[in-house]
C-alpha cells in the first residue's frame, strides 16, 4: 500500500507475551514522507483509549520506517491490556490497530513458561 499518508504498521489482533519485572519496548512502526508526525500511545479501557502521559518514549529510525517506542522499565502486572498508537498528521488523527500485552506475573507462576507455550495459549496469560 504505497501512499504519502502516514501509516502505522501494527497488525490487527497482534499480541506480546511478556513477564512482569522484565524490561519491554512496545514499538509503533510509522511510515511518513516529509515531516515526522506527532505520535502518542494510549491504553484501552473498555472502548476508550486513555492517553499515556509522562511515560518514557523514544524514536528509532530505520531505513524506510521510524519506530515510536513505549518503554516499560520494568513491566508491571498492571501493564496487562491493549494499547494503540496514534499519529497527528495534517490535523487528522490516524489510529493504529490495538496490540495486546499479556503479562505473566512471575511471582504467581510456579515456573516461567516457554515462549511456545505462551504463544500457543495466550488465554492462560491474563493476570
Amino acid at each position: 500500500k504505497e501512499s504519502c499518508d502516514v501509516q502505522l504498521y501494527i497488525k490487527r489482533q497482534s499480541y506480546h507475551s511478556i513477564f512482569a519485572g522484565d524490561p519491554f519496548k512496545l514499538e509503533c512502526p510509522v511510515k511518513y514522507c516529509a515531516h515526522r508526525p506527532q505520535v502518542t500511545w494510549c491504553k484501552l479501557n473498555g472502548t476508550t483509549c486513555v492517553k499515556l502521559e509522562g511515560r518514557h518514549t523514544s524514536w528509532k529510525q530505520e531505513k524506510n520506517l521510524s519506530f515510536f517506542i513505549l518503554h516499560f522499565e520494568p513491566v508491571l502486572p498492571s501493564d496487562n491490556g491493549s494499547y494503540r498508537c496514534s499519529a497527528n498528521f495534517l490535523s487528522a488523527i490516524i489510529e493504529s490497530h490495538s496490540t495486546t500485552l499479556y503479562v505473566t506475573d512471575v511471582k504467581s507462576a510456579s515456573e516461567r513458561p516457554s515462549k511456545d507455550e505462551m504463544a500457543s495459549r495466550p488465554w492462560l496469560l491474563y493476570s
Epitope: Q7, I10, R12, Q13, S14, H16, S17
Partner: antibody, heavy 119, light 112 residues
Framework: EVQLQQSGAELVKPGASVKLSCTAS????????MYWVKQRPEQGLEWIGR????????RYDPKFQGKATITADTSSNTAHLQLSSLTSEDAAVYYC????????????WGAGTTVTVSS | DVVMTQAPLTLSVTIGQPASISCKSS???????????LNWLLQRPGQSPKRLIY???KLDSGVPDRFTGSGSGTDFTLKINRVEAEDLGVYYC?????????FGGGTKLEIK
C-alpha cells in the same frame, strides 16, 4: 503478486507425524499473518490456526490444539504445519493462506497439500 | 465459537440471471475497531478457495463488479447480478472478527 507454493502430497501411517510447508513469494511474511485450513473430502473448510511470522506467536482453534503446530521461518519466507498422531480423521487437503496483517489488502491461498493416512 | 449459517445449500441458476446467498452469524461480527470482518470465498471445482469480498463489501482486485456484498452485525448477503459460467463452484462466508475463525457450510452454485 503474492503467491504460495505448498509442499507435495503425503502418504503417512496411522500414529505418525507429518510436516507440511508453504513458501510465500511477492511479500515478506513478517508483514503478514499465515494460516492453515483443513478440508476433508467433499466437506467444508475448518480453520486450524494462524501464525504471526514476525514474532512466532500463534492462535489455534482449540479443537486442533495438541494436534497441529504452526511455525514460520522468516529466512526462507516459509510457514509449516506439523500434524501429530495421525488418524483417518486427519486425511484431508490442507491449505495454507497468507493475508496482509495491517490492511487486509490481500488474502491468497495455496493450492493445497493432500494428506492420506493409511497403513 | 461463532456459528456461520449459509442458505441455500445449493443454488441452481440460469446464466444471465441473478443469484443471492445468505450468511448469518451467531454473534455480531462488528469489531471494536468499528469494522466488520466478514469475507466471501469462491472455491471452483478442483481448485483452492479464492477471496472475492472482504470487510463485508470490498471487492478483491480482479473480481468483477457483478458481485456485491452487503449486510451488518449478524446478517450478510452475497449477490451476483448476472451469473456467468465461470461463477460455478462453492461459495463460503467466513468471519475474521473473533477467534477461532469460522466458516459457513458453503453454498454450491450450479448452472441450470
Amino acid at each position: 503478486e503474492v503467491q504460495l507454493q505448498q509442499s507435495g502430497a503425503e502418504l503417512v501411517k496411522p500414529g505418525a507425524s507429518v510436516k507440511l510447508s508453504c513458501t510465500a513469494s511477492g511479500v515478506n511474511i513478517k508483514d503478514t499473518y499465515m494460516y492453515w485450513v483443513k478440508q476433508r473430502p467433499e466437506q467444508g473448510l475448518e480453520w486450524i490456526g494462524r501464525i504471526d511470522p514476525a514474532n512466532g506467536y500463534t492462535r489455534y482453534d482449540p479443537k486442533f490444539q495438541g494436534k497441529a503446530t504452526i511455525t514460520a521461518d522468516t529466512s526462507s519466507n516459509t510457514a509449516h504445519l506439523q500434524l501429530s498422531s495421525l488418524t483417518s480423521e486427519d486425511a484431508a487437503v490442507y491449505y495454507c493462506a497468507v493475508y496482509d496483517g495491517y490492511y487486509e489488502s490481500f488474502d491468497v491461498w495455496g493450492a493445497g497439500t493432500t494428506v492420506t493416512v493409511s497403513s | 465459537d461463532v456459528v456461520m449459517t449459509q442458505a441455500p445449500l445449493t443454488l441452481s441458476v440460469t446464466i444471465g440471471q441473478p443469484a443471492s446467498i445468505s450468511c448469518k452469524s451467531s454473534q455480531s461480527l462488528l469489531d471494536s475497531d468499528g469494522k466488520t470482518y466478514l469475507n466471501w470465498l469462491l472455491q471452483r471445482p478442483g481448485q483452492s478457495p479464492k477471496r472475492l469480498i472482504y470487510l463485508v463489501s470490498k471487492l478483491d482486485s480482479g473480481v468483477p463488479d457483478r458481485f456485491t456484498g452487503s449486510g451488518s452485525g449478524t446478517d450478510f448477503t452475497l449477490k451476483i447480478n448476472r451469473v456467468e459460467a465461470e461463477d460455478l463452484g462453492v461459495y463460503y462466508c467466513w468471519q475474521g472478527t473473533l477467534f477461532p475463525r469460522t466458516f459457513g457450510g458453503g453454498t454450491k452454485l450450479e448452472i441450470k
